[in-house]
Amino acid sequence: VTGSRVYPANEVTLLDSRSVQGELGWIASPLEGGWEEVSIMDEKNTPIRTYQVCNVMEPSQNNWLRTDWITREGAQRVYIEIKFTLRDCNSLPGVMGTCKETFNLYYYESDNDKERFIRENQFVKIDTIAADESFTQVDIGDRIMKLNTEIRDVGPLSKKGFYLAFQDVGACIALVSVRVFYKKCPLTVRNLAQFPDTITGADTSSLVEVRGSCVNNSEEKDVPKMYCGADGEWLVPIGNCLCNAGHEERSGECQACKIGYYKALSTDATCAKCPPHSYSVWEGATSCTCDRGFFRADNDAASMPCTRPPSAPLNLISNVNETSVNLEWSSPQNTGGRQDISYNVVCKKCGAGDPSKCRPCGSGVHYTPQQNGLKTTKVSITDLLAHTNYTFEIWAVNGVSKYNPSPDQSVSVTVTTNQAAPSSIALVQAKEVTRYSVALAWLEPDRPNGVILEYEVKYYEKDQNERSYRIVRTAARNTDIKGLNPLTSYVFHVRARTAAGYGDFSEPLEVTTNTVPSRIIGDGANST
């Protein structure tokens, strides 16, 4: 029975005489008068078995002690650690010619674990062992036994096991402990690759190449390799593994992303929080599920927020010019969180008696610049039929519109084509300008071409460049535009509408709001 003693992780003990409970029972030659098994107390008052010999008075000593058979366990090189005490010959009277201060260490490889006799000629010498510290009679009196530790190695070994032997040639010696071990590079994980226990090579300079295996939930990026050095240390890690999608490195292993996190690819990145408007309900998510009403386009990365279709375009205005219609609108209030917004135009030809009976306009109608995928907020439609009701729908679309098409994404206008809409208004004037308002007035168009039903004023801040405009409608030839910002340049356009539709807008009138009230007359082009 052996008791366990703690040694370095890179050493595997094959024999430890101090761990043996009871007699060691090694073979001595001669059987008597040479090596003798003696029980002594160690530094912790634990009994340990030792072998002693002290035939220093007699010449030509040749006392052999052989261990039991020691299994090799696949090791090619083993290490022998001997702890011993040795008496100083100078401290012994009358032994000058016969006392020695060394002993010899031998080994013999064998597949036979039950060899009963010592055959000296079978053994190969490892080394002569000398003491760094020898002790005298004074040391014995003081109970100071000077313990020597010597380590030798032997290899390459090839048979199943071996025997060790100690040859005494006339020393006063006590073998306190004998430990035989080999070195291994212990199981380790590096770069998410596991490297197994690996026995070191046959010679003291050899490196054993070992291929690692990726830990659970990981895959090879480059082949993971390490070298096991002769001292039992791992050297030169090469290559690595990466945690699979849905997993991240944590304490040398690949663990599933937590709920609410995801990882789309096998990379060395950590899991990321689900992007806006998405979630994950399981551990180990490789992508996150979009919230209800939100979507991902086919080419959207997993890291992109989920988005939704845009709302309808705003402020759709039409301008009928005989059998042509110009449509203009503003961007939707909500783009759905995407930049890839475009517009499609749907044209329907409707019966005069029953506006609900509408049919597609057909291929004879032409759109400038195009009917679908418009990037601008205006379109010109030509080659319509005269005196016909048309309904035009402007659809705002983005990369996810196809997943949830809804009428909420369009705005429509119904017009009647004619032979002549009113001409444009020649003169627009700013009658009064205050901090927050502008009073406008204008003349009737030169050619009304019918009864003027109303006027439409379009205005916007000059530096907004017509991107964000407002519309005011009035039956009179003047209006007060309120709610403006002080000291801000505004651009105004006015047009007239008859039953035939809208005329063209007037030339722009630019007005800057004041800090103090003033009464001025504009000239239709510029006013300050």
């Epitope: 292993e253 663990q255 937590k258 709920i259 609410g260 996190y261 950590t270 929080k273």
Partner: antibody, heavy 115, light 109 residues
């Protein structure tokens, strides 16, 4: 779902002590488990964690002083060589699968180290 | 390894009042929001209040509010009740390590 620590007692310095956390209502193969301690009148201190896989990880200050292991229904904390500074209430706690933190705690067990 | 600095170490407030506890991390916590708040009363186990910096744990009254991101986090307790007298701890996670703040003892006057 509950946790119950046991094994806390008075020990002399240097005498190894093992605390046990018994789990019920969930599987240790699905959750990571941590140990946390609290010295009398002091704050909470995270010791270490045993992952579902059985691998362990310790706070820097705890390395070599504690060993965490588990069976199918228990998680053990071994205090390898207790000192008087290890006198504390020891809690085992379950790491959430939803967030990084502990969502279920045991009532704790008191360890007193004194000569 | 992340260090969590909690302030103040103690605070006293009246019933119906509001208490604010701060927790500062020495570096950004994992995901910028992996921070939890716990309440502990004498002789009892810690109780989870808030996780992921701002999500209220099940059964916790909405008087408890967590906020913050990265390195700065706050726990606010409004409409204080006598039952809120306890010590409150933040817990941060980063690079395999958990760290508790030093704790804030809340007394109710």
């Amino acid at each position: 779902q509950s946790l119950e620590e046991s094994g806390g007692r008075l020990v002399t310095p240097g005498t190894p002590l093992t605390l046990t956390c018994t789990v019920s209502g969930f599987s240790l193969s699905s959750y990571h488990m941590s140990w946390v301690r609290q010295a009398p009148g002091k704050g909470l201190e995270w010791i270490g964690i045993i992952y579902r896989s059985g691998n362990t990880y310790y706070a820097n200050w705890a390395k070599g002083r504690f060993t965490i292991s588990k069976t199918s229904t228990t998680v053990d904390l071994k205090i390898t060589s207790p000192t008087t500074e290890d006198t504390a209430t020891y809690f085992c706690a379950r790491e959430s699968s939803t967030f990084y933190g502990m969502d279920l705690w045991g009532p704790g067990t008191l360890v007193t180290v004194s000569s | 390894y992340v260090m969590m600095t909690q302030t103040p170490s103690s605070v006293s407030a009246a019933v119906g009042g509001t208490v604010t506890i701060n927790c500062q991390a020495s570096q950004s916590v994992y995901g910028n929001n992996e921070l939890a708040w716990y309440q502990q009363k004498p002789g009892q186990r810690p109780k989870l209040l808030i996780y992921r910096a701002s999500t209220l744990a099940s059964g916790v009254p909405s008087r408890f509010k967590g906020s913050g991101s990265g390195t700065e986090f706050t726990l606010t307790i409004s409409d204080l009740e006598c039952a809120d007298a306890a010590t409150y701890y933040c817990l941060g996670y980063k690079s395999d390590d958990y760290t508790f703040g030093g704790g804030t003892k809340v007394e109710i006057k």
